[in-house]
């Protein structure tokens, strides 16, 4: 029942043991020996799907939003619900599926062809409306296959970093994602507070390269919090 889901924070449904699974190709970390890998799939399937209780959209998956499961239901009981497809009703961007955003109460396509002219207008709307936040854009970045061009090169549209060539990562650019260079030592990087931090970041930088982490530049330690410069530095 939903109540038992909401009242429990314990880890459940641990998989039974199974002899050594193979590592993931191209991964520098090991697979888990003694762990069952359902269907051999690294990512979650939604068989026996149990709703996840939430307080905000950021707690849900990238194709979900947080809301009461019933119309006019108890506002205190919220779960992650499947995103809404194009032309469905919405109250905020996070309700719309990847590649869409909420405009005038309807999920509409955010593909580059007709979206660019509405960027400025949408930002204005978002600041003036409690129900319309840019948080949705930070997560709704999946693009339809028709928008792909040369795979993997810098500037190519992507879904995830594995779509990009070596030395590149998949990062937001407006409300699509493109392959950008992984940051090198000394380059400026972005350090977020983890929770809900990506909302206004429409030009996202890549992460720092191997052996580097994003830290405050030493000569900026005395600067105010808002002006601290972070750069990629050796561990």
């Amino acid at each position: 029942t939903l109540n038992s889901v909401l009242n429990s924070n314990a880890i459940k449904n641990l998989p039974p043991p199974l002899g050594g699974a193979a590592g993931h190709p191209g991964s520098a970390v090991s697979a888990a020996p003694g762990i069952l890998y359902p269907g051999g799939n690294k990512y979650q399937t939604i068989d026996n799907y149990q709703p996840y209780p939430c307080a905000e959209d950021e707690e849900c998956g990238t194709d979900e939003y947080c809301a009461s499961p019933t119309r006019g239901g108890d506002a205190g009981v919220q779960i992650c619900l499947a995103c809404r497809k194009r032309r469905k009703r919405c109250m905020r961007h996070a309700m719309c599926c990847p590649g869409n955003y909420c405009k005038n109460g309807i999920c509409v396509s955010s593909d580059q062809n007709h979206f660019r002219g509405e960027i400025e207008e949408t930002i204005t709307e978002s600041f003036g409306n409690d129900h319309s936040t840019l948080d949705g854009y930070s997560r709704r970045t999946t693009l339809s296959s028709k928008m792909y061009h040369t795979k993997g090169q810098e500037g190519s549209v992507c879904l995830r970093s594995s779509d990009c060539a070596s030395g590149l990562c998949c990062a937001r650019h407006f409300w699509s994602k493109i392959c950008k260079p992984v940051l090198k030592e000394g380059q400026v990087c972005t350090k977020h507070r983890r929770k809900g931090s990506h909302g206004l970041e429409i030009f996202q930088r890549c992460y720092c390269g191997e052996g580097l982490s994003c830290r405050i530049q030493k000569d900026h330690h005395q600067a105010s919090n808002s002006s601290r410069l972070h750069t990629c530095q050796r561990h």
Epitope: N9, N13, K195, Y207
Partner: nanobody, 128 residues
Framework: EVQLVESGGGLVQPGGSLRLSCAAS????????MGWFRQAPGKERELVAA????????HYADSVKGRFTISADNSKNTAYLQMNSLKPEDTAVYYC?????????????????????WGQGTLVTVSS
Amino acid sequence: EVQLVESGGGLVQPGGSLRLSCAASGFNFDDYAMGWFRQAPGKERELVAAISWSLSRTHYADSVKGRFTISADNSKNTAYLQMNSLKPEDTAVYYCAAAPRPKRVSVSYFSTASNYDWGQGTLVTVSS
């Protein structure tokens, strides 16, 4: 490419404390859940604790509730497991793990081992 390096394991007496660290690199830390698993000799690997990508949710195995605390420091791309009131039965190899934010998340997502990439592990021995 996901890289996870654990540290902080060692020998500790029953009732003592340890803090494990997991240095992560090669991925956007903000977009991953971090977990700690453990595997005792002759036993299956079990998830001890996990923290969500939003940092707002933590999940614990019943056996460690009230004793262990998972946390993450985004400024250092590091996850931690603070272990207090350690017992001999906590003796195991502890593995750091990272799971990407999925399209859809369910109650069982954090406890499903196949969602995670893994570090090499650090040994924790609780003995007098």
